[in-house]
């Protein structure tokens, strides 16, 4: 969209499930009628043609011009449509990656799930909800990021080497919090600041590793909008 006209942004991690929320305010008298509700989710990809089978029919409609100073936008298409009888139609090859929770729908939650989200899923989404006597909509922009954990120096380490682990997600704003943990047996053990572990924002500095440090290390990045991502790295320390 042009600057000054933006819809709410939802972030997701490439390769992980993504929820595109849509829970419009529905008057109480309509809640009993939700079984007859229909919902259509449509997607306007950010750039490039949507990942689709060649020649797949697109939803009917006009071909409106793009905003000034922008090139032609990929055409909108229907991702998933659920009719009043629960009849579904959608666009391959997104299916069966796209899902609506049937029980959620009967509670007025028309969120779309992408399992998993892929890079081509980025873009603007619109949901149209048809109830018996009213129509409601949800709009959002899905942005996809890549999560990674890097070790410096990379590769296997020897006892008493140092290493810095850097936890990152390709999103412009900084995380509100970073939590480090180790996977031990069945549970996660938080990593706290100590002479052996120095934490600084998204970095974890281990000044002297030992073979006991071998194994999975993880971090959880949490952003102000509530989005969080968990990233794992397998550290190898030779005896």
């Amino acid at each position: 969209l042009q600057p000054g006209a933006e819809v709410p942004v939802v972030w997701a991690q490439e390769g992980a499930p993504a929820q595109l929320p849509c829970s419009p305010t529905i008057p109480l008298q309509d809640l009993s009628l939700l079984r007859r509700a229909g919902v259509t989710w449509q997607h306007q990809p950010d750039s490039g043609p949507p990942a689709a089978a060649p020649g797949h029919p697109l939803a009917p409609g006009p071909h409106p011009a793009a905003p000034s100073s922008w090139g032609p936008r990929p055409r909108r298409y229907t991702v998933l449509s659920v009719g009043p009888g629960g009849l579904r139609s959608g666009r391959l090859p997104l299916q069966p990656r796209v899902q609506l929770d049937e029980r959620g729908r009967q509670r007025g939650d028309f969120s779309l799930w992408l399992r998993p989200a892929r890079r081509a899923d980025a873009g603007e989404y619109r949901a149209a909800v048809h109830l018996r006597d009213r129509a409601l909509s949800c709009r959002l922009r899905l942005r996809l990021g890549q999560a990674s954990m890097t070790a410096s120096p990379p590769g296997s380490l020897r006892a008493s080497d140092w290493v810095i682990l850097n936890c990152s997600f390709s999103r412009p704003d900084r995380p509100a919090s970073v939590h480090w943990f180790r996977n031990r047996g069945q549970g996660r053990v938080p990593v706290r600041e100590s002479p052996h572990h120095h934490l600084a924002e998204s970095f974890l500095f281990l000044p002297q590793v030992s073979p006991m440090d071998s194994g999975p290390w993880g971090c959880i990045l949490t952003y102000r909008d509530g989005f969080n991502v968990s990233i794992m790295y397998n550290l190898t320390v030779l005896g």
């Epitope: 933006e6 819809v7 009917p60 129509a135 409601l136």
Partner: antibody
């Protein structure tokens, strides 16, 4: 070219009935949601009624609910508005409009309008 | 129902002027606002949809912006054919509602 042509307007007494028709051409009528919008003389625009492409959902403005009925005949490429129990405040130019998408509710094609006058 | 309030109700301007019309929604409609132009005795014509997208064939001097509750239609350089009445409309939810209109007159 894409065209909508309304007919059926005229002078009617309060409490009377009228049926407006809209003939569509130049596009696949059955693929589009359609709507009626009216404009009282010298006033602004008021949405009246809407029907989805498949006819699954029909909506009315509170001001006409129970008195007006929207319908469509895809075989005839036609949209209708049956208006009963007409009141003086229903006096307006009635426009037949195409809804851009079933799920995107702005109006991209308008007919020329037909005038309905309710007066004794 | 969502109320759409346009301002000003009328504006006088000259050819070549830059004109801005605003529309305020009574609740958040994200970017679901359209703008129409209507000339006397004629049907309205769609100019802008989804707050900022120009409809097919609409000259580039027309632009829209805004999100949430505040929206703007801008005509960068008025042409003689632009003198008309302009309406905003929310297309977020039914009942679909219009602003009361802004009449753009020649100064």
């Amino acid at each position: 070219q894409v065209q909508l042509v309304e007919s059926g307007g005229g002078l009617v007494k309060p409490g009377g009935s009228l049926r407006l028709s809209c003939a569509a051409s130049g596009f696949t009528f059955s693929s589009y949601a359609m709507s009626w919008i009216r404009q009282a003389p010298g006033k602004g625009l008021e949405w009246v009624s809407y029907v989805t492409s498949g006819g699954d959902y029909i909506y009315y403005a509170d001001t006409v609910k129970g008195r007006f009925t929207i319908s469509r005949d895809d075989a005839k490429n036609s949209l209708y508005l049956q208006m009963n129990s007409l009141r003086a405040e229903d006096t307006a130019v009635y426009y037949c409009t195409r809804v851009a998408y079933d799920y995107e509710w702005y109006f991209d094609v308008w007919g020329q309008g037909t005038l309905v006058t309710v007066s004794s | 129902d969502i109320q759409m309030t346009q301002s000003p109700s009328s504006v006088s301007a000259s050819v070549g002027d830059r004109v801005t019309i605003t529309c305020k929604a009574s609740q958040d409609v994200t970017t679901a606002v359209a703008w129409y132009q209507q000339k006397p005795g004629k049907a309205p014509k769609l100019l802008i949809y989804s707050a900022s997208y120009r409809y097919t064939g609409v000259p580039s001097r027309f632009s829209g912006s805004g999100s949430g509750t505040d929206f703007t239609l801008t005509i960068s350089s008025l042409q003689p054919e632009d003198f008309a009445t302009y309406y905003c409309q929310q297309h977020d939810q039914s009942p679909w509602t219009f602003g009361q209109g802004t009449k753009l007159e020649i100064k």
